[in-house]
């Protein structure tokens, strides 16, 4: 029969012969021959291959470097890479999560719209009229101004986006 020019799925062509690829988690030790099958070997410690392959070396698991603020979110296996995430208070600088930066704080006049996660930064929003934030924080939302009326008090000093209203006693009319 004619030597093949193309092979089935999960096979590869070598020396005019179709050989089985190694399954995920295993590397190639030797190609098949007319008389023998492909020889594969499982990846070793801290190594992986995540596809059917003919690689002679497995890939190293990603290292979650604590000096870059990283920690292991999911330990790798022979078929999967390690997944890193950031330490508490930090978030990834990219989708690959190769390093971390400190969560941004929202300045006075701004509140937290969305608290940061391991993969996304804090989202801030300006405090609208009727709300304020007087601290720089990665957690605090804008707080509503105090309602003087409900305390039987009057506004002595108007609030801003950074300060609360100042309430005071009602002026009593002298008889």
């Amino acid at each position: 029969p004619e030597p093949p020019t193309a092979c089935r799925e999960k096979q590869y062509l070598i020396n005019s012969q179709c050989c089985s690829l190694c399954q995920p988690g295993q590397k190639l030790v030797s190609d098949c021959t007319e008389f023998t099958e492909t020889e594969c070997l499982p990846c070793g410690e801290s190594e992986f291959l995540d596809t059917w392959n003919r690689e002679t070396h497995c890939h190293q698991h990603k290292y979650c470097d604590p000096n870059l603020g990283l920690r292991v979110q999911q330990k790798g296996t022979s078929e999967t890479d390690t997944i890193c995430t950031c330490e508490e208070g930090w978030h990834c600088t990219s989708e690959a999560c190769e390093s971390c930066v400190l969560h941004r704080s929202c300045s006075p006049g701004f509140g937290v719209k969305q608290i940061a996660t391991g993969v996304s930064d804090t989202i801030c929003e300006p405090c609208p009229v009727g709300f304020f934030s007087n601290v720089s924080s990665a957690f605090e939302k804008c707080h509503p101004w105090t309602s003087c009326e409900t305390k039987d008090l009057v506004v002595q000093q108007a609030g801003t986006n950074k300060t609360d209203v100042v309430c005071g006693p009602q002026d009593r009319l002298r008889a």
Epitope: G25, S30, E37, T38, E39, L41
Partner: antibody, heavy 120, light 111 residues
Framework: EVQLLESGGGLVQPGGSLRLSCAAS????????MSWVRQAPGKGLEWVSA????????YYADSVKGRFTISRDNSKNTLYLQMNSLRAEDTAVYYC?????????????WGQGTLVTVSS | QSALTQPASVSGSPGQSITISCTGT?????????VSWYQQHPGKAPKLMIF???QRPSGVSNRFSGSKSGTTASLTISGLQAADEADYFC???????????FGGGTKLTVL
């Protein structure tokens, strides 16, 4: 029908040598990885050694590394285990086992075993 | 490398289901989907029942099934029969230089 027949076991003194053979039939011998697995009397199973279909790649358990040698002769459909510097703890039934296709860490057919006794 | 941990014995009545656990580490069961199970009747050679965690070789009854969660593999036998009474061994590839390790074995008694 797949058949594996071990031979070569027996009584040997500590420090002595033995060569086990496993005659295979009923399948294309060179297409399968092969292993030796042993079982001490009344104990569990222990993987000993394996070889790929070509015989080029060989693998050993730490407990036998440097003392045992696995080999195969594909023209004779035979697997071998040369055992040197034998110790009392090597006493066991030695099984020849066929690897499931090229995966020598699965054993889909086993021989009936040959008993190796290491004693003075 | 120490053996995988299996219960020494389990028992069940005919028709029941039983599960045998096999606990390893992140270096063996947890790292590889290369777990197999063997049945051994007294005085006989072992027989492959499950490979690659949950695959059954042809000729093995579908009453036998395998699974894995984290570092523990399990063999479940449903519709227990008298002929299932035997020793069962789990096995896994390992990152250690020993390559392959077995569990200590579980004696299954059908009451």
């Amino acid at each position: 029908e797949v058949q594996l027949l071990e031979s070569g076991g027996g009584l040997v003194q500590p420090g002595g040598s033995l060569r086990l053979s496993c005659a295979a039939s009923g399948f294309t011998f060179s297409r399968n990885a092969m292993s030796w697995v042993r079982q001490a009397p009344g104990k569990g199973l222990e993987w000993v050694s394996a070889t790929g279909g070509s015989g080029i790649s060989t693998y050993y358990a730490d407990s036998v590394k440097g003392r045992f040698t696995i080999s195969r002769d594909n023209s004779k459909n035979t697997l071998y285990l040369q055992m040197n510097s034998l110790r009392a703890e090597d006493t066991a039934v030695y099984y020849c086992a066929r690897g499931y296709s090229n995966s020598w860490w699965y054993f889909d057919y086993w021989g009936q075993g040959t008993l190796v006794t290491v004693s003075s | 490398q120490s053996a995988l941990t299996q219960p020494a014995s389990v028992s069940g009545s005919p028709g029941q289901s039983i599960t045998i656990s096999c606990t390893g580490t992140s270096s063996d069961v947890g790292n590889y989907n290369l777990v197999s199970w063997y049945q051994q009747h007294p005085g006989k050679a072992p027989k492959l029942m499950i490979f690659e965690v949950n695959q059954r070789p042809s000729g093995v009854s579908n009453r036998f099934s395998g699974s894995k969660s984290g570092t523990t593999a399990s063999l479940t036998i449903s519709g227990l029969q008298a002929a299932d009474e035997a020793d069962y061994f789990c096995c896994s590839y390992t990152t250690s230089s020993t390559y392959v390790i077995f569990g200590g074995g579980t004696k299954l008694t059908v009451l």
